[in-house]
C-alpha cells in the first residue's frame, strides 16, 4: 500500500492489492473488492505523464484520426466504384480506427480528471477492448494490404470479383479473430476503486493475482500470434516488392508507382517502429518483469508505448493516400476546402470555354475528368 513511512513499495507497476474481501451485505448486495496501490503506482496515477501527456496525445489522435478515417471510410464505401481487395482492406482499417477513436473523448476526460472513470464498468470494458482490438486489427489488415500490394505486382491480372470476395471473407475472419482474442478484456473486471486517491481506474490498476500470470501469458500469445507472425509476412511482402520494383523496366508511370510504393513502405515501417513494435514489446516485458520480479521498471515506457500505439489511427490515412487514387483526390480537395465535384465542374467549365463558348454539352457530373495539381 502507498505508505509514506514505508518506502519499500511492492512494485513499480499498477498492481492492485486487495484491501477488503468482497462480501454480501444483509440485503444480498455484493460489495466490490477495493484495492490499494504502491506509492510508485500512485505517483503515476496522479502525475503529469498520465494526466497531461496522455490526454494531449489522445486529443491529437482524435482530432486527426476521426475526420481522416471518417472521410476514408466514406470514400471507400461510396466514392470508389471498383471495390478492389486493397479498398476492402483499407475500408476495414478505417473502420477499426473509427471504432477505437470514437471512444477517445471518454479516455481523454478520464485522464484529465486524474484517471477517474465515471462512465461505468461496461463502457470501460468496451474502451479497452476496442483499444487493443484496433491495434491488432490494424496489424492484420495492414498485413493483408501489404501482401495484396505485392500480389498485384506479381500477378496484375486476375478475376476482380473473386479477389474482392476473398478479401471480404478474410476481413470477416479477421474481425471474428479479433473479437475472440479480445474476449478476456471484456470479461475481466477493468474498473477498480482506490479510496486513497478517490478515483476509479479503468484498466490502469488490475488485481495482482490476475496481473502476474494471466496478463503475461495473454499478451505474449498476442505478441507472437497477432504481431510477430503478421510483421514477418508484411516485411517479406515489402522486401519482395522492392526486389520486383528494382528489376522492372522504368517508364514515367512505373517511376511514379515505384515512388508511391516506397512511400507506402516507409509509412508502414514507421507505423511498426512507432506504434506496433514498442507497444507489443513493452506489453510483454512489463508483464514479464511483474511476473518474475514483482515490479516493472519500464512502467513509464510501457505507458508511453501504449499511448504511441494509438498514433496508428493518424498514420493509416497516409497509407490510404499512397494506395487509393480516390482517397488521394478527396484528401487533396478536403484540404483545399472544395469538393471533387466542384473541381470537376471547374475543369469541365474551363475545357468547354476553351473549345467553344456556345457549347453546353459538358455536364457537371462528369466522372471521366481526373483531378491533377
Amino acid at each position: 500500500t502507498i505508505q509514506g513511512t514505508n518506502r519499500s513499495s511492492k512494485g513499480r507497476s499498477l498492481i492492485g492489492k486487495v484491501d477488503g474481501t468482497s462480501h454480501v451485505t444483509g440485503k444480498g448486495v455484493t460489495v466490490e473488492t477495493v484495492f490499494s496501490v504502491d506509492e510508485f503506482s500512485a505517483s503515476v496515477l496522479t502525475g503529469k505523464l498520465t494526466t497531461v501527456f496522455l490526454p494531449i496525445v489522445y486529443t491529437i489522435v482524435f482530432v486527426v484520426g476521426l475526420p481522416s478515417n471518417g472521410m476514408a471510410l466514406w470514400v471507400f464505401l461510396f466514392r470508389t466504384k471498383k471495390k478492389h481487395p486493397a479498398v476492402i482492406y483499407m475500408a476495414n482499417l478505417a473502420l477499426a480506427d473509427l471504432l477505437s477513436v470514437i471512444w477517445f473523448p471518454l479516455k481523454i476526460a478520464y485522464h484529465i480528471h486524474g484517471n477517474n472513470w465515471i462512465y461505468g464498468e461496461a463502457l470501460c470494458n468496451v474502451l479497452i477492448g476496442f483499444f487493443y482490438g484496433n491495434m491488432y486489427c490494424s496489424i492484420l489488415f495492414m498485413t493483408c494490404l501489404s501482401v495484396q500490394r505485392y500480389w498485384v505486382i506479381v500477378n496484375p491480372m486476375g478475376h476482380s470479383r473473386k479477389k474482392a470476395n476473398i478479401a471480404i471473407g478474410i476481413s470477416l475472419a479477421i474481425w471474428l479473430l479479433i473479437l475472440l482474442v479480445t474476449i478476456p478484456l471484456y470479461v475481466v473486471k477493468q474498473t477498480i476503486f482506490i479510496p486513497a486517491l478517490n478515483i476509479t481506474t479503468c484498466h490502469d490498476v488490475l488485481p495482482e493475482q490476475l496481473l502476474v500470470g494471466d496478463m503475461f501469458n495473454y499478451f505474449l500469445s498476442l505478441a507472437i500470434g497477432v504481431f510477430l507472425f503478421p510483421a514477418f509476412l508484411t516485411a517479406s511482402a515489402y522486401v519482395l516488392m522492392i526486389r520486383m520494383l528494382r528489376s522492372s523496366a522504368m517508364d514515367e508511370n512505373s517511376e511514379k508507382k515505384r515512388k508511391r510504393a516506397i512511400k507506402l513502405i516507409v509509412t508502414v515501417l514507421a507505423m511498426y517502429l512507432i506504434c506496433f513494435t514498442p507497444s507489443n514489446l513493452l506489453l510483454v516485458v512489463h508483464y514479464f518483469l511483474i511476473k518474475s520480479q514483482g515490479q516493472s521498471h519500464v512502467y513509464a515506457l510501457y505507458i508511453v508505448a501504449l499511448c504511441l500505439s494509438t498514433l496508428n489511427s493518424c498514420i493509416d490515412p497516409f497509407v490510404y493516400y499512397f494506395v487509393s487514387h480516390d482517397f488521394r483526390d478527396h484528401a487533396k480537395n478536403a484540404l483545399l476546402c472544395r469538393s471533387v465535384r466542384t473541381v470537376k465542374q471547374m475543369q469541365v467549365s474551363l475545357t468547354s470555354k476553351k473549345h467553344s463558348r456556345k457549347s453546353s454539352s459538358y455536364s457537371s457530373s462528369s466522372t471521366t475528368v481526373k483531378t491533377s495539381y
Epitope: 500500500t1 502507498i2 505508505q3 509514506g4 513511512t5 518506502r7 484491501d19 477488503g20 462480501h23 451485505t25 460489495v31 473488492t33 477495493v34 506509492e39 500512485a42 505517483s43 496515477l45 496522479t46 494526466t51 486524474g114 482506490i194 479510496p195 486513497a196 486517491l197 478517490n198
Partner: antibody
C-alpha cells in the same frame, strides 16, 4: 520530524471572512495530500477539506462547499483555508493534517496543534 | 454520506481491565477504518488504520478488528494513559466521516 503549525484563527463576525495558514516542515510537502479537520468546543471531529499533492483535485463536505477554499503553496510548504460567509456553526478549533500515505489520503496521521476560530457578533 | 455510529458514548474501566468500543458504518467500508485517541486539550492521535494495522509507537495492548460495516477497538490491560476520547473514521469514500466519539475514563 513532521511538524504542522496553524495560524490565522481568531474572533470574527458572522458573514465575514478569515484565512487560516499551516506551515509544514520535516517532510517533502509536495508529495502529500493535506486536509483540514475541525472540532467545535466539546463536540466531535468533522472533516472540512482535502487537497491533492499537486493541488489538482479538491474535496469538501456539503456543509462548507462554496464557502471554504483549500489551497496550497508547495514552494512555501504552506496549506491555506480561506473561509468566507462564516456562520456561528463554523466556530471550532481547526486542525491541519497530513496523511501517512504518499500521494493519497485515507486517514490523518499527523496533526497540528490547532487554531481556534470564534464566530460571534 | 457514510454515517459512523460509535458505542458506547462513554465508559469507565479499572486498571488492568479490557474494554471494547464498537463502530458501525452505514455501508460496507472494506476495512478502511481508523481509530484516534484524543486527550483533553490535545490534538487527536492516530492509533489504528486499515481496521487492524497498529501505528508505530502505539502499544500492542491496543488492537482493532472487524470487516464490512462492523468494527471494534479493544484495549487490554487498561492503563492511566488510555484515558481520553476515542473516535473512529472511515477512509473509504468522501466525505470522510468520524464517529461521535467514546469517552474512556479510569475508575
Amino acid at each position: 520530524e513532521v511538524q504542522l503549525v496553524e495560524s490565522g484563527g481568531g474572533l470574527v463576525q458572522p458573514g465575514r471572512s478569515l484565512k487560516l495558514s499551516c506551515v509544514a516542515s520535516g517532510f517533502t510537502f509536495n508529495n502529500y495530500w493535506m486536509s483540514w479537520i475541525r472540532q467545535a468546543p466539546g463536540k466531535g471531529l468533522e472533516w472540512v477539506a482535502s487537497i491533492t499533492n499537486t493541488g489538482g483535485r479538491i474535496f469538501y463536505p456539503d456543509s462548507v462547499k462554496g464557502r471554504f477554499t483549500i489551497s496550497r503553496d508547495n514552494a512555501q510548504n504552506t496549506l491555506y483555508l480561506q473561509m468566507n460567509s462564516l456562520r456561528s456553526e463554523d466556530a471550532a478549533t481547526y486542525y491541519c493534517t497530513r496523511d501517512r500515505l504518499y500521494y493519497g489520503s485515507n486517514w490523518f496521521t499527523y496533526w497540528g496543534q490547532g487554531t481556534l476560530v470564534t464566530v460571534s457578533s | 454520506d457514510i454515517q459512523m455510529t460509535q458505542s458506547p458514548h462513554s465508559l469507565s474501566a479499572s486498571l488492568g481491565e479490557t474494554v471494547s468500543i464498537e463502530c458501525l458504518a452505514s455501508e460496507a467500508i472494506s476495512n478502511y477504518l481508523a481509530w484516534y485517541q484524543q486527550k483533553p486539550g490535545k490534538s487527536p492521535q492516530l492509533l489504528i488504520y486499515y481496521a487492524s494495522s497498529l501505528k508505530d509507537g502505539v502499544p500492542s495492548r491496543i488492537s482493532g478488528s472487524g470487516s464490512g460495516t462492523q468494527y471494534s477497538l479493544k484495549i487490554s490491560n487498561m492503563q492511566p494513559e488510555d484515558e481520553g476520547v476515542y473516535y473512529c473514521q472511515q477512509g473509504y469514500k468522501y466525505p470522510r466521516t468520524f464517529g461521535g466519539g467514546t469517552k474512556l475514563e479510569l475508575k
